[in-house]
């Protein structure tokens, strides 16, 4: 099966790489604009230059194109703890990231929030904190993992999943409760 091509891709595939079909005259292939520029006017004829203009401040194009407008620069989301790693230039969008000792959690494909890396108190670091993943902790005996923190088994209620890890402690607590009722 031949994959379905959009109209724009169909038109572009007729011309050699780096060129696109003139929208009003499909016998003309115009040279695409370089990254950092956008299409102001199509080339008037074969072998003639495409009129490309540089992107204005606050906009960019990251690859060769025949876009009528540059793309707006992204803004880092302060409310999500994001910081600017590198500013937007005419040929590259803003790069946003997190501070040192933080990791990115992606709520969706294009939205991330910065959180502090876990320190594994009352446990040991199994896997170090990565750019897109929190530290993986292994808890010491008498502690269980809850929301990536090692919590004392004294906080383990029978209904929770921690019961298997904290079974001896829970039995002890139950024992003391029982002895207290006599």
């Amino acid at each position: 099966l031949v994959p379905h091509l959009g109209d724009r891709e169909k038109r572009d595939s007729v011309c050699p790489q780096g060129k696109y079909i003139h929208p009003q005259n499909n016998s003309i292939c115009c040279t695409k604009c370089h990254k950092g520029t956008y299409l102001y006017n199509d080339c008037p004829g074969p072998g003639q230059d495409t009129d490309c203009r540089e992107c204005e401040s606050g906009s960019f194009t990251a690859s060769e194109n025949h876009l009528r407008h540059c793309l707006s620069c992204s803004k880092c989301r302060k409310e999500m703890g994001q910081v600017e790693i590198s500013s937007c230039t005419v040929d590259r969008d803003t790069v946003c990231g997190c501070r040192k000792n933080q990791y990115r959690h992606y709520w969706s494909e294009n939205l991330f929030q910065c959180f502090n890396c876990s320190l594994c108190l009352n446990g040991t670091v199994h896997l170090s904190c990565q750019e897109k993943q929190n530290t993986v902790c292994t808890c010491h005996a008498g502690f269980f993992l809850r929301e990536n923190e090692c919590v004392s088994c004294s906080n383990c209620k029978k209904s929770l999943e921690c019961t298997k890890l904290c079974l001896p402690q829970i039995e002890n607590v139950k024992g003391t409760e029982d002895s207290g009722t006599t």
Epitope: R77, E79, M80, H105, W107, Q113, F115, N134, E147, N148
Partner: nanobody, 119 residues
């Protein structure tokens, strides 16, 4: 004690509109970034939209961009979600929540309001 109470859900035909509200109490509403998330039947939580403390900066998931509008009234401690041009795929339980701080889970989230888009 933090309380979030959503209202405004219901059964609506495709193309229709609804306005969800979330009444907040037990914390300083104006100090918190507020979030709408939703859960479609048999699916996980989806981030729909959020709004900064003063109502200036907003974010929308691609699936709702141009159709939904988030807003807040700090004097009334209330968060809103105006939903227009509703589609069958918008059917879900909608929750309002405080932006998580400690990690990627919702410490404070309402009970939710069901939106059913069917015609």
């Amino acid at each position: 004690e933090v309380q979030l109470l959503e209202s405004g859900g219901g059964l609506i035909q495709p193309g229709g509109s609804l306005r969800l509200s979330c009444a907040a109490s037990g914390f300083t509403f104006g100090n918190e970034v507020m979030v709408w998330v939703r859960q479609a039947p048999g699916k996980g939580l989806e981030w729909v939209s959020h709004i900064d403390r003063v109502g200036q900066d907003t974010y929308y998931a691609d699936s709702v961009k141009g159709r939904f509008t988030i807003s807040r009234d700090n004097s009334k401690n209330t968060l809103y979600l105006q939903m227009n041009s509703l589609r069958a795929e918008d059917t879900a339980v909608y929750y309002c929540a405080l932006l998580p701080k400690r990690g990627p889970w919702f410490d404070y989230r309402g009970q939710g309001t069901l939106v059913t888009v069917s015609g």
